[in-house]
């Protein structure tokens, strides 16, 4: 009743290991770390066989097969590199995830290195089996902005890719009788969200009620340079239109809004987000220089009344930009208080422009980003949104442009986007 001697499988062992095995003796076959017992094409951790009465074993010895983690999961906006020859995916093989640079960056500066574990799962030291996240890089145009000229009014043509966050927002309100059409600018914050001014997305009513336009009436163009040629641009419809709940049409306080795009847009040299600032009640420091781009009025001799009556005919075809200094708050408040009309400059606003005039943002630039370069992070940060200006024509002497102070709304923006600030740290000015 003695059974034949057993040979353990390659990369495996049998327990108990004995010189002789008799009727009713049982052995357990297991494999080394990184290998699995394979019996009749079925993988298992262990396999038991028994010495039968007739001196034969109940089953043949199974084989040990190396664990295979199989093809790794695809990473959105990322790439996979195999570190092991022949693109092996077996035990102890290594792969490296990376993000599509320079448009995406890995969250928390993760190494992206994953090793095939004994359990047959790709594992990372920090994230475990979870895949890394590729977040859009912000505030780093593919084309570096030129040395800032002192001088849109008094602006200059922007080269394609200089302002990759710039969005053209077109509102065609077909629910109005007759239909209403207008436009403004916005800034890309992520692949799915546009930041703009609330007054751009408020229904142009005959009363002062604040009601957002229907999402169906909003189209967003990204990567656009010349408004006469939209073929190279990405156009997207809106999934949501969110106005700040406290937006006040009477003084334009809280003039900030968001558009969620129907589908995330692919990022590239002409479509990249801008960075949000830190939560900072002070806002940008006086005399700091910022840039604003827009397709608004670029003719300094056109009056506001002419602009309003001529509709879109006075637009710039090519995106314009202008460099403007931040004006001390007290100086701006004083310049507006001296004017007839209710022109209160609140703590949620800041001003920019030149005392002597000649350079300014204008109608049609509304909602566009006033960006300042942050030396620490080497990124462009949206500090303001084009909001309003005085009763005189754009670029008039001592009539500063007024901008929404974005740094007062960082928490609100993250909340609307449904992302806790800590999760999206690369998006924040550092």
């Amino acid at each position: 009743n003695e059974c034949p001697e057993l040979q353990p499988p390659v990369h495996g062992k049998i327990e108990p290991s004995q010189a002789k095995y008799f009727f009713k003796d049982q052995v357990l076959v297991s494999c080394d770390t990184g290998y699995k017992v394979l019996k009749d094409n079925v993988e298992m951790d262990t396999f038991q066989i028994e010495c039968l009465k007739d001196g034969t074993w109940s089953n043949k010895i199974p084989t040990c097969k190396i664990v295979d983690c199989r093809a790794p999961g695809e990473l959105e906006h990322g790439l996979i590199t195999f570190s092991t020859r022949n693109n092996l995916t077996t035990y102890k093989s290594e792969i490296k995830y990376s993000c599509q640079e320079p448009y995406y960056k890995m969250l928390n500066n993760n190494t992206g290195i994953y090793t095939c574990s004994a359990q047959g799962v790709w594992m990372n030291k920090v994230l475990g089996r979870s895949l890394p996240t590729c977040l859009p890089e912000c505030g780093q145009p593919s084309r570096s902005l030129p040395s800032l000229v002192k001088r849109i009014i008094g602006g200059r043509n922007a080269e394609p890719g200089l302002f990759p966050w710039q969005a053209l927002i077109v509102v065609e309100d077909t629910s109005r009788v007759p239909n209403d059409k207008w436009f403004g600018s916005g800034a890309l914050l992520s692949a799915s969200w546009i930041l703009t001014a609330a007054h751009v997305l408020r229904s142009q009513r005959r009363d002062t009620t604040v009601i957002p336009v229907s999402k169906e009436h909003v189209t967003v163009y990204l990567g656009l340079h010349d408004v006469r040629d939209k073929s190279g641009a990405v156009n997207s419809s809106a999934a949501r239109v969110v106005l700040h709940p406290d937006f006040n049409i009477q003084n334009y306080n809280h003039d900030i809004a968001l558009v969620q795009l129907q589908e995330p847009v692919p990022l590239g040299p002409h479509v990249m987000p801008v960075c949000l600032p830190r939560l900072e009640p002070e806002g940008p420091a006086p005399h700091m220089l910022g840039l604003v781009a827009g397709w608004g009025i670029s003719n300094p001799n056109v009056t506001v009344d002419e602009i309003i009556s001529s509709g879109t005919r006075t637009l710039s075809d090519v995106l314009q930009y202008v460099k403007l200094p931040v004006v001390p708050h007290a100086e701006c408040k004083t310049s507006y208080e001296s004017r007839s009309g209710n022109y209160s400059v609140t703590e949620n606003m800041f001003c920019a422009g030149y005392y002597e005039g000649g350079k300014d943002t204008c109608l049609g630039d509304s909602g566009g980003a006033f960006v300042i370069f942050d030396d620490l992070s080497q990124r462009w940060v949206v500090q303001g949104l084009v909001s309003w200006g005085g009763p005189e024509e754009c670029g008039s002497k001592q009539v500063y442009g007024v901008y929404t102070k974005v740094s007062n709304y960082v928490d609100w923006v993250w909340e609307q986007m449904g992302l806790p600030q800590s999760v999206v740290e690369p998006q924040v000015e550092r």
Epitope: T174, S175, R176, V177, H199, S203, R205, R206, D207, T208, T209, I211, S214, I249, Q250, N251, Y252, V304, I308, G341, N342, Y343, W388, P391
Partner: antibody, heavy 114, light 112 residues
Framework: QVQLKQSGPELVKPGASVKLSCKAS????????INWVKQRPGQGLEWIGW????????KYNEEFTDKATLTVDVSSSTAFMELHSLTSEDSAVYFC???????WGQGTLVTVSS | DIVMTQSPSSLAVSAGEKVTMSCKSS????????????LSWYQQKPGQSPKLLIY???TRESGVPDRFTGSGSGTDFTLTISSVQAEDLAVYYC????????FGGGTKLEIK
């Protein structure tokens, strides 16, 4: 074409309530608020309130907050105004309007009498 | 609350004449940000519903004859009918939409 069709005249007893309707057609009902206006015989116009069908938001003239309740039925593109605790002072023609007063209903005469 | 005062309460003119009527508000209806005055003018003919003539103080509603002109800013507004026609017999109301809505008492236009 745009139309606002209001319900027919009502003769109601003092203390009772009445519900007037305003059926809209020919435009985007949910995107335009409905206003209600009162006009007593030989008198001027008084704004009662408005309702925004997209989300049911209402705004009232303070003098009518306890008197009128505005509702909508989006499925039938119809706005309603219920008037409560009626007195002879409520005898009037009630108009609905929409698309920011570009279009008006023909009016509903409400007579409160015992 | 904003109070709207119209004057005169009634006036009689002959066909072809120019007529002006006034509407004053107890506070400014101008919003400097939008550069608009939130004031409308309505015409109500006998036995009919009101009809919108002018909004934002001076913008003529589609289909309204160009003999009707709205002007003014802040607290003082005027409706002018350049050459009165027999069919203009009506009561004319102004309405503020700066803070909710308030109608003026109306100006009754009679044709001599």
């Amino acid at each position: 074409q745009v139309q606002l069709k209001q319900s027919g005249p009502e003769l109601v007893k003092p203390g009772a309530s009445v519900k007037l309707s305003c059926k809209a057609s020919g435009y985007t009902f949910t995107s335009n608020d409905i206003n209600w206006v009162k006009q007593r015989p030989g008198q001027g116009l008084e704004w009662i309130g408005w309702i925004y069908p997209r989300d049911g938001t209402t705004k009232y003239n303070e003098e009518f907050t306890d008197k009128a309740t505005l509702t909508v039925d989006v499925s039938s593109s119809t706005a309603f105004m219920e008037l409560h605790s009626l007195t002879s002072e409520d005898s009037a023609v009630y108009f609905c309007s929409s698309v920011e007063d570009s279009y008006w209903g023909q009016g509903t005469l409400v007579t409160v009498s015992s | 609350d904003i109070v709207m005062t119209q004057s005169p309460s009634s006036l009689a003119v002959s066909a072809g004449e120019k007529v002006t009527m006034s509407c004053k508000s107890s506070q400014s209806l101008l919003i400097s940000r939008t550069r608009k005055n939130y004031l409308s003018w309505y015409q109500q003919k006998p036995g009919q519903s009101p009809k919108l003539l002018i909004y934002w103080a001076s913008t003529r509603e589609s289909g309204v004859p160009d003999r009707f002109t709205g002007s003014g800013s802040g607290t003082d507004f005027t409706l002018t009918i350049s050459s009165v026609q027999a069919e203009d017999l009506a009561v004319y109301y102004c309405k503020q939409s700066y803070n909710l809505y308030t109608f003026g008492g109306g100006t009754k236009l009679e044709i001599k």
